[in-house]
Interface confidence: low
Amino acid sequence: MGSRRGPWPLVWAVLQLGWWPGWLLDSPDRPWSPLTFSPAQLTVQEGENATFTCSLADIPDSFVLNWYRLSPRNQTDKLAAFQEDRIEPGRDRRFRVTRLPNGRDFHMSIVAARLNDSGIYLCGAIYLPPNTQINESPRAELSVTERTLEPPTQSPSPPPRLSGQLQGLVIGVTSVLVGVLLLLLLTWVLAAVFPRATRGACVCGSEDEPLKEGPDAAPVFTLDYGELDFQWREKTPEPPAPCAPEQTEYATIVFPGRPASPGRRASASSLQGAQPPSPEDGPGLWPP
C-alpha cells in the first residue's frame, strides 16, 4: 500500500516545479509570477505583421504592461503600453497591444514590419500597489527579411507553373494556328475544285459521251492536275486557261463500285468512300 502511494508526492512535486519554474528562479518574496514572451524567435517578411504574445501567469488587480525594444546600445525603447484596461499607443502607431479575452495574454503586434524593426523585444509588467515591483519577460528576437529574398524559397514552384502555363499556351496557339492553316488549305482546295463543279465540267468537244442531263444524272467532277498548285502564293491562282484537250492532264480518282474512265474523269455518283489511288492509276492528287 505504502509503496504504491510513494511516487505520487514526487510526481506532484515535479508537476508543481514544471508549472512554476519561476519559483526556482525568483526570490521567495517576489509578489508576481514570471512573464512569458513568445515566440523566442520570430521571422516575418517585410510588410507582414509580426505578433508576439506577452502572457501573465496571473492577473493582478492593478498593473501596467509595457512593450519594449532593446536598442543596439542596450537601451530599451518603449513601444506601447497597456494600463487600466486601455491601450496606450506609442509614437509609432504600427506598434499595437491587444488584450485577449482570457485577460492574461496580450498580443503585441508590429503592423507592416520593416527591415529596421529587426531586433530584440520584451514586455515588462509594473505591478501597482500593494505589490510595487517591476517584472520583465525574457527577450525575444524578431527578424524581418526582405520581400525579394523570401520568395526564392517558394519560387521553385511558381516558375514551373508559369512555364507550364506558357508551354500550354504555346501548344494551344500552335494547335490553333495549324488548324487555321489546315482550314485555309482545305478552303483553298475546295475553292479550286467546287467552282468548276458548279459551273460544270470543262466541255472541250472531246469524244467523251455528252454529260447526262436530268434529275437522275449525277454531276461529273473533273480535276485538272495543273490547277493543284500547293506552293504558297500571295495572289489567288489565275483562272484556268481555255480548254485545250491536248494540254490538259486529268487526275484519276478511283471510287469502289464503279470503274472510272481511264485517265479522264470520275463520276460523282460513285462516291461511296474514296480510296487512295494506286500507283498504276496515273498521276495522283499530290505533286511528287
Epitope: N66, Y68, L70, N74, Q75, T76, D77, K78, A81, Q83, E88, G90, R91, L122, G124, I134, E136, S137, P138, R139
Partner: nanobody
Framework: QVQLVQSGGEVKKPGGSLRLSCAAS????????MGWYRQAPGKQRELVAF???????NYADSVKGRFTISRDNAKNTVYLQMNSLKPEDTAVYYC??????????????WGQGTQVG
C-alpha cells in the same frame, strides 16, 4: 551610473500642496522610466506614480486626481506635484529611475529620499 538628487520635501498640513523634484545626473535621463515611491514607517515601499520615457503616466489608486507626475528631459528632472495632501500621505518619498538592461533584468537607481508630512 545615474545619481538622483531629490528636493522639495517638508512638513505640510492636511489639504496643502507640495512639489517634489528629482534631478538625474548624466545625459541618458530620457531613456529611463521614472517613478516616485513612498514608504511609511512599518510599511512596505509602494509605487505612487510612474512616468515612462514617452510620457505615459500611472498612478496609485490612493493618489489619483491629487498627484501629478511630470518630467523635463531637457533638465533631466522628474516632478511630483502633490495636492490635497492627506495624513496617510505622510511617508518618505523616493525617486526611482528604471530601465531594462541588456541582461533583461531591471536596472534601477534610487534617490536619497525626501520626508513628506
Amino acid at each position: 551610473q545615474v545619481q538622483l538628487v531629490q528636493s522639495g520635501g517638508e512638513v505640510k498640513k492636511p489639504g496643502g500642496s507640495l512639489r517634489l523634484s528629482c534631478a538625474a545626473s548624466g545625459s541618458i535621463f530620457s531613456i529611463y522610466d521614472m517613478g516616485w515611491y513612498r514608504q511609511a514607517p512599518g510599511k512596505q515601499r509602494e509605487l505612487v506614480a510612474f512616468i515612462t520615457r514617452g510620457g505615459s503616466t500611472n498612478y496609485a489608486d490612493s493618489v489619483k486626481g491629487r498627484f501629478t507626475i511630470s518630467r523635463d528631459n531637457a533638465k533631466n528632472t522628474v516632478y511630483l506635484q502633490m495636492n490635497s495632501l492627506k495624513p496617510e500621505d505622510t511617508a518618505v518619498y523616493y525617486c526611482n529611475a528604471d530601465r531594462v538592461g541588456a541582461t533583461m533584468r531591471r536596472v534601477s537607481y534610487w534617490g536619497q529620499g525626501t520626508q513628506v508630512g
